[in-house]
């Protein structure tokens, strides 16, 4: 196990992840169906899940829920035991994801719904679907930090990025992001790289000259497409691309992010702000390592929980993503990419073993809280019983955790097929993505197979049932590795399930007489809304008991039944981490104090608006960021970064009123404006029509149940399609434009072409 004590980093940037326009599962959790990933993970495998619409067409993307983002609360509430402030994990600074970072790399991409994760997480409390990331478990930072930490992860449930990660989506498979959040720049890259640069003959330059073909397609997102439920049209579980069984969900899981931390206390959103400003966080440098490919055997995770009392919490996250390396998550698994997305091929290659975690100095002025640290070593055993490479070696050693930092970028660049694109195929070589600031861990070890996944589309006869016309060789959709684990049944929108091609793809002229009942779209049955797996009811603040035996039936099934988890010292642990005994660590009696310090926003770079304009209203539940004509062109932080949103505990709605949003092309707003955001066919009106930026994704305060920042722009832009800034999804496609939900098709095209270097 990578260090036994891996602190699961809070993905600062989860924000985008949950709720990035992905389906929102119950509880407001955005279900990002890993299309593939989930399936692989045994997460929801909704065959043919209808992708959520970008929403680009319709604000409420077809999947009505698709875009709704989980409420902050939903995201943060999970498992965090509010009771033990002392336990609160030190807030991890809200790390900004580098502009170039793909959403996936950044971990911003859609993340599996909490539910999914919840269901499958090992040892999760049945109800708390969320596993507190160990990072959360980290030594308590200032009280309330946990919450905020959570907040720091926009939308990130406590659960590590989910199961899908755990399950490691097959490369290229991903839940539908519905065009989500790659950063505009990234989008451009991808787009550029992708479409045109893709294989086609290089497009000629205006001059008619052919542009050099792209070097290599960077399929950065491929690995991770986290969100599209639709990915697999048919339910047929197709093996993960890696061929990993869904079980491999434990991404090398050195540490199981999902390991519930009982004592974790949700931190107030403000915390994040504070933390982000106050607490330096070391961002994991290393790319996330996907599991080594080929590890098909499900890993058994044995959690060794060591509770070391009075361990000085390391503020720095040098270890940060130790587990990361361990997690087999698909490299860069999409939004959840653990680290920078490694190229598909890069699935964890020989990543150097990170040095042991070094305690990071606590931020100055912050006393190091000594709180027993629950160290969970997750010993992942492959079916063969051996731990993953990482796991094997690390099962017991704490220090062995690999630190991804400095991990060489292993992602092999996918050789670019000869530029076949008619368009230029400038392809950017796959570069090691920067490690996302907050890699997301997939916590759910056990992949749950959604009931939907269980459903097999029955072939419909010519009697009028849905037929899947499958080109030869085309494997029926939905062939995704299905996890054995029982997944929470998800409603699966009828997905066309092409019968698994039995060796021979249907011949193209042949009617693939496959009609599969259940095929999506059986007349009237087809619903674009991705089926929302019914998440187990989660109580927002349950402390995930580290107990191995899953308590809730569903969770039990979904969880890998860890062999008796050797919890060496647990017998000495008298109280649950969140138990009151631990509260003593917090003088406050476990009260999480959300101190809304007025952050010096001057330092906060928020794309949402100038920091200066953000006025924190302590008592006002609504923070209104009044935008004077703000020149966002230079703003680099994500709109919605928690640091920028001062969530008032009571705050309900954050309204960002922009008098004039001067989105310059330069604005690299992760929130969905591509650099090209100015490209509004409407003539350049840069004003965004009142769009609600649902910062639920980003606003994490528990109290903020999805505070929505209303982006009110006095001037209605002529753009017929307002940019859905909230739709930040990581799309690996070159045609990434989806992600930002550029205001117009032209923007998307431009972004895509820009990516391609066209």
């Amino acid at each position: 196990m990578a260090e036994p004590r891996q602190e699961f980093e809070v993905m600062e940037d989860h924000a985008g992840t949950y709720g990035l326009g992905d389906r929102k599962d119950q509880g407001g959790y955005t279900m990002h169906q890993d299309q593939e990933g989930d399936t692989d993970a045994g997460l929801k495998e909704s065959p043919l899940q209808t992708p959520t619409e970008d929403g680009s067409e319709e604000p409420g993307s077809e999947t009505s829920d698709a875009k709704s983002t989980p409420t902050a609360e939903d995201v943060t509430a999970p498992l965090v035991d509010e009771g033990a402030p002392g336990k609160q994990a030190a807030a991890q600074p809200h790390t900004e994801i580098p502009e170039g970072t793909t959403a996936e790399e950044a971990g911003i991409g859609d993340t599996p719904s909490l539910e999914d994760e919840a269901a499958g997480h090992v040892t999760q409390e049945p109800e708390s679907g969320k596993v507190v990331q160990e990072g959360f478990l980290r030594e308590p930072g200032p009280p309330g930090l946990s919450h905020q930490l959570m907040s720091g992860m926009p939308g990130a449930p406590l659960l590590p990025e989910g199961p899908r990660e755990a399950t490691r989506q097959p490369s290229g498979t991903g839940p539908e992001d519905t065009e989500g959040g790659r950063h505009a720049p990234e989008l451009l890259k991808h787009q550029l790289l992708g479409d045109l640069h893709q294989e086609g003959p290089p497009l000629k330059g205006a001059g008619g000259k052919e542009r050099p073909g792209s070097k290599e397609e960077v399929d950065e997102d491929r690995d991770v497409d986290e969100s599209s439920p639709q990915d697999s049209p048919p339910s047929k579980a197709s093996p993960a691309q890696d061929g990993r069984p869904p079980q491999t969900a434990a991404r090398e899981a050195t540490s199981i992010p999902g390991f519930p931390a009982e004592g974790a206390i949700p931190l107030p959103v403000d915390f994040l702000s504070k933390v982000s400003t106050e607490i330096p966080a070391s961002e994991p440098d290393g790319p996330s390592v996907g599991r080594a490919k080929g590890q098909d055997a499900p890993l058994e995770f044995t959690f060794h929980v060591e509770i070391t009392p009075n361990v000085q919490k390391e503020q720095a996250h040098s270890e940060e993503h130790l587990g990361r390396a361990a997690f087999p998550g698909a490299p860069g698994e999409g939004p959840e990419a653990r680290g920078p997305s490694l190229g598909e091929d890069t699935k964890e290659a020989d990543l150097p073993e990170p040095s042991e975690k070094q305690p990071a100095a606590a931020p100055r002025g912050k006393p190091v809280s000594r709180v027993p640290q629950l160290k969970a070593r997750m010993v992942s055993k492959s079916k063969d019983g051996t731990g993953s490479d990482d796991k094997k070696a690390k099962t017991s050693t704490r220090s062995s955790a690999k630190t991804l930092k400095n991990r060489p970028c292993l992602s092999p660049k996918h050789p670019t097929p000869g530029s076949s694109d008619p368009l230029i195929q400038p392809s950017s070589p796959a570069v090691c993505p920067e490690p996302p600031s907050s890699p997301k861990y997939v916590s759910s070890v056990t992949s749950r197979t959604g009931s939907s996944g269980a459903k097999e589309m029955k072939l419909k006869g010519a009697d009028g049932k849905t037929k899947i016309a499958t080109p030869r060789g085309a494997a029926p959709p939905g062939q995704k590795g299905q996890a054995n684990a029982t997944r929470i049944p998800a409603k699966t929108p009828p997905a066309p399930k092409t019968p698994p091609s039995s060796g021979e793809p249907p011949k193209s002229g042949d009617r693939s007489g496959y009609s599969s009942p259940g095929s999506p779209g059986t007349p009237g049955s087809r619903s674009r809304t991705p089926s929302l797996p019914t998440p187990p009811t989660r109580e927002p603040k349950k402390v995930a008991v580290v107990r191995t035996p899953p308590k809730s039936p569903s969770s039990a099934k979904s969880r890998l039944q860890t062999a008796p988890v050797p919890m060496p010292d647990l017998k000495n642990v008298k109280s649950k981490i969140g138990s009151t005994e631990n509260l003593k660590h917090q003088p406050g009696g476990g009260k999480v104090q959300i101190i809304n310090k007025k952050l010096d926003l001057s330092n906060v770079q928020s794309k949402c608006g100038s920091k200066d304009n953000i006025k924190h209203v302590p008592g006002g539940g609504s923070v209104q960021i009044v935008y004077k004509p703000v020149d966002l062109s230079k703003v680099t932080s994500k709109c919605g970064s928690l640091g920028n949103i001062h969530h008032k505990p009571g705050g309900g709605q954050v309204e960002v009123k922009s008098e004039k949003l001067d989105f310059k092309d330069r604005v690299q707003s992760k929130i969905g404006s591509l650099d090209n955001i100015t490209h509004v066919p409407g003539g350049g009106n840069k004003k965004i029509e009142t769009h609600k930026l649902t910062f639920r994704e980003n606003a994490k305060a528990k109290t903020d149940h999805g505070a929505e920042i209303v982006y009110k722009s006095p001037v209605v832009s002529g753009d017929t399609s307002p940019r859905h800034l909230s739709n930040v999804s990581s799309t690996g496609s070159i045609d990434m434009v989806d992600s930002p939900q550029l205001a117009t098709l032209a923007d998307e095209v431009s972004a895509s072409l820009a990516k391609q270097g066209l």
Epitope: P51, G172, D195, E199, R222, S227, P681, T731, V749
Partner: antibody
Framework: QVQLQQPGAELVRPGASVILSCKAS????????IHWVKQRPGRVLEWIGR????????RYNENFKSKATLTVDKPSSTAYMQLSSLTSEDSAVYFC????????WGQGTTLTVSS | DIVITQDELSNPVTSGESVSISCRSS???????????LNWFLQRPGQSPQLLIY???TRASGVSDRFSVSGSGTDFTLEISRVQAEDVGVYYC?????????FGGGTKLEIK
Amino acid sequence: QVQLQQPGAELVRPGASVILSCKASGYTFTNSWIHWVKQRPGRVLEWIGRIDPNSGGTRYNENFKSKATLTVDKPSSTAYMQLSSLTSEDSAVYFCSRGVLHDYWGQGTTLTVSS
Amino acid sequence: DIVITQDELSNPVTSGESVSISCRSSKSLLYKDGKTYLNWFLQRPGQSPQLLIYLMSTRASGVSDRFSVSGSGTDFTLEISRVQAEDVGVYYCQQLVEYPYTFGGGTKLEIK
């Protein structure tokens, strides 16, 4: 080389649903959108919608939202379009094309809706 | 939706001659970024459309330089010089400024 393979024809009864497939090869499937375009005999091309294979995000022509559902299966690099409640009006050639610019097109699947 | 209108060429052209195919948009396709979001496709008989020109003036790979586009804003002309037999087919212009993508009705080019 980039190729989008589509079945040549589909015969379906009215009221039924059909799933047309488009298998992509020669490029990274998740890097480019897959569009679906309808062409009725009159030569007119109608854009139905597009899906981002990477994210599953979709965009539909309002005229087809209730008719088509786009999905993808990444593992097989195949895009699917389900057409429901078929009527004779849906009889047409359906093409899938790649990328924002529709730089590559499949050969099209001729869908015949007939009782 | 943006409506794209194309004239049908009813008169066959002689090989070697030049021909102009017009395309009109109900809305300017010149985007604020200075690019004109207009594509041209050729659909040869029995085949699927193929991209000829994108963003109004850039030829797709492999496309002959005999094809050029002129015009701006809402009126465009695809000019094919020295028409050849292989140029026969239906030419479609497509706007990429706003969703939904819309295509013109197509102009059929025939050679005498």
